[in-house]
Interface confidence: medium
């Protein structure tokens, strides 16, 4: 199948293409004679001296020293098979279904799968990961403790782009009207700390109160926002006079 062994082209002697056609289009053999199915991601390619590209558009044939078992086995593509097709663009893309795909090739594969199920084709909306509004991964938990104690609330959020996390103290006025006070404000017994992670596009924030006073009792809201939306979760800090006043649920200790 290399160029120096190519005889005259005899289309009648070419092996037939699959009756249902080639999913990724057709290409020609190394001699430029017989039509054959273009190869997809992970499929064997690159046999023959001329090394005519057997890979589908958007893919390239990458030489593989070690043949991957079950992907390009000894018999996989006939003599001279020396590589596998990989996606040229190996960056994530966002599909019209809201899913982030590792590459455009995988998006195209997902689109074909969707169409084969009678669903709408998936198109590329943008390069990079899909944007998504924030969501609360781990909300803060209610805390009961005595005055003078050191307590903290934590909150873990995720979103794309990575959300901005702030803390508010919720103040409920008359007739159910509520207003929020952005923390830390001017309180010197209260500190806010925020860091990225633990996962990509996640943010974790803490409110540290030390020493705890009666004025610190109330509802604290963790609020996350990005260009796609916002999310919030809240927890209460209850200040008691003595440890024995802290209610203990059966089988668990109080959050101190």
């Amino acid at each position: 199948s290399s160029s120096d062994t190519c005889g005259p082209c005899e289309p009648a002697s070419c092996p037939p293409l699959p009756p249902l056609g080639c999913l990724l289009g057709e290409t020609r053999d190394a001699c430029g004679c017989c039509p054959m199915c273009a190869r997809g991601e992970g499929e064997p390619c690159g046999g023959g001296g001329a090394g005519r590209g057997y890979c589908a558009p958007g893919m390239e044939c990458v030489k593989s020293r070690k043949r991957r078992k079950g992907k390009a086995g000894a018999a996989a593509g006939g003599p001279g098979v020396s590589g596998v097709c990989v996606c040229k663009s190996r960056y994530p893309v966002c599909g019209s279904d809201g899913t982030t795909y590792p590459s455009g090739c995988q998006l195209r594969a997902a689109s074909q799968r969707a169409e084969s199920r009678g669903e709408k084709a998936i198109t590329q909306v943008s390069k990079g990961t899909c944007e998504q509004g924030p969501s609360i991964v781990t909300p803060p938990k209610d805390i009961w403790n005595v005055t003078g104690a050191q307590v903290y609330l934590s909150c873990e959020v995720i979103g794309i782009p990575t959300p901005v996390l702030i803390w508010n103290k919720v103040k409920r006025g008359h007739y159910g009207v509520q207003r929020t006070e952005l923390l830390p404000g001017d309180r010197d017994n209260l500190a806010i700390q925020t860091r990225g992670g633990p996962e990509k596009h996640e943010v974790t924030g803490w409110v540290l109160v030390s020493p705890l006073s009666k004025e610190d009792a109330g509802e604290y809201e963790c609020h996350a926002s990005n260009s796609q939306g916002q999310a919030s979760a809240s927890a209460k800090i209850t200040v008691v006079d003595a440890l024995h006043e802290i209610p203990v649920k059966k089988g668990e200790g109080a959050e101190l």
């Epitope: 990724l24 499929e43 079950g70």
Partner: nanobody, 128 residues
Framework: SVQLQESGGGLVQTGGSLRLSCAAS??????????MGWFRHAPGKEREFLTA????????YYTDSVKGRSTISRDNAKNTVYLQLNNLKPEDTAVYYC???????????????????WGQGTQVTVSS
């Protein structure tokens, strides 16, 4: 030699569901290098192609007779291909066969002659 063994057939009421399995085995048989298909053979009819899946499992194809009520899938680690059949009708009564064709190309194969290995079949009977 290569063996394909279907299972999961049986008697089911109209509107019911079945999940057929096809386990492949054989020395030096690399299941993940094979495209797989399901066919059925009803008495007095030709063997009918139903659905196919590429070697990687990335692509699936369904004929109109089962589209929207069946799902083909494969587990290359278990050397098994599956066919989930839903909303079964009496006309689905047949012997169901799985078949394998060596192919590491993204293409579907729909004709009996293209497939190299066949199972013994499993009977599916749909009663009204």
């Amino acid at each position: 030699s290569v063996q394909l063994q279907e299972s999961g057939g049986g008697l089911v009421q109209t509107g019911g569901s079945l999940r057929l399995s096809c386990a492949a085995s054989g020395r030096s048989f690399t299941f993940s290098s094979y495209a797989m298909g399901w066919f059925r053979h009803a008495p007095g009819k030709e063997r009918e192609f139903l659905t196919a899946i590429t070697w990687s499992g990335d692509y699936t194809y369904y004929t109109d007779s089962v589209k929207g009520r069946s799902t083909i899938s494969r587990d290359n680690a278990k050397n098994t291909v599956y066919l989930q059949l839903n909303n079964l009708k009496p006309e689905d009564t047949a012997v169901y066969y799985c078949a394998a064709k060596f192919s590491q190309v993204s293409a579907f194969f729909a004709t009996v002659s293209e497939y190299e290995y066949w199972g013994q079949g499993t009977q599916v009977t749909v009663s009204s």
